[in-house]
């Protein structure tokens, strides 16, 4: 089948880098600068992706293969491949339209990318806050506060009780 | 092919002025929001404003506020940016940026941006 095809189409004899040239007998030239082929048998080469302003390249283009972008220090990639570049925040801010603003009180936000997130309720599931909350950091929760007893310490949980007269196992 | 070009910046004084313009082709101007981004030598890319479809709605960064304004002309496919009273720490190159499909929804994310023009404060 092979051998069929390239007697009925020259251009499948092509390789990656080239492209089979029509303006001259469909013989294999190669790409032109800052276009790229990354499989045989192509009539055309595509233009390589161009990484400015806010991308930045990655990996140059080659003959065979396509230029890969990231973002400029100070944004961070969206998208499949890197087709956009984002805004980084502090952290303890979230990105608006307006640009970086502070979380409101009761959310955070660890990271410079995201949006910032309600601090953990840990009445939900019985515990107490043992260490509060701040723009960039979540709640702390400890234990609930029925085991916070007098004397009892706020971190480590009280030992098991025992019946009088039974040494320890 | 969608291409952003863009032009004015130069060399000025401080409390010196300059409009920066950004020729947008290849694709519909009045669809997307846009940008000016900026990076300082030696800085990473900072955020300076950006405009929306209509020119309704804009909004800059602290430092500019008051001294620069970010305008469009979706007739001339233009965008601009007006910076007044400029200072030392505005020196940097300017770009222009379209804001993706979805920007300001789903995402701040900027598809495509120039090469850039350089402004330089100093006396």
């Known amino acids: 089948f092979e051998r069929t095809r390239s007697l009925q189409d020259p251009c499948s004899n092509c390789p990656a880098g080239t492209f089979c040239d029509n303006n001259r007998n469909q013989i294999c030239s190669p790409c032109p600068p800052n276009s790229f082929s990354s499989a045989g048998g192509q009539r055309t080469c595509d233009i390589c992706r161009q990484c400015k302003g806010v991308f930045r390249t990655r990996k140059e283009c080659s003959s065979t293969s396509n230029a890969e972008c990231d973002c400029t220090p100070g944004f961070h990639c969206l998208g499949a491949g890197c087709s956009m570049c984002e805004q980084d925040c502090k952290q303890g801010q979230e990105l608006t339209k307006k640009g970086c603003k502070d979380c409101c009180f009761g959310t955070f936000n660890d990271q410079k990318r995201g949006i910032c997130r309600p601090w953990t309720n840990c009445s939900l599931d019985g515990k107490s806050v043992l260490v509060n909350g701040t723009k960039e950091r979540d709640v702390v929760c400890g234990p609930s506060p029925a085991d916070l007893s007098p004397g009892a310490s706020s971190v480590t949980p009280p030992a098991p009780a025992r019946e009088p007269g039974h040494s320890p196992q | 092919e969608v291409q952003l070009v863009e032009s004015g910046g130069g060399l000025v004084q401080p409390g010196g002025s300059l409009r920066l313009s950004c020729a947008a082709s290849?694709?519909?101007?009045?669809n997307y929001w846009m940008n000016w981004v900026r990076q300082a030598p030696g800085k990473g890319l900072e955020w300076v404003a950006n405009i929306n479809q209509d020119g309704s709605e804009r909004y800059y960064v602290d430092s500019v506020k008051g001294r620069f304004t970010i305008s469009r002309d979706n007739a001339k496919n233009s965008l601009y940016l007006q910076m007044n009273s400029l200072r030392a720490e505005d020196t940097a190159v300017y770009f222009c940026?379209?804001?993706?499909?979805?920007?300001?929804?789903?995402?701040?994310?900027?598809?495509?941006s120039g090469q850039g023009t350089t402004v330089t404060v100093s006396s």
């Open positions: 290849g694709f519909t101007l009045s």
């Open positions: 940026a379209r804001g993706g499909e979805g920007y300001g929804v789903d995402h701040y994310g900027l598809d495509v």
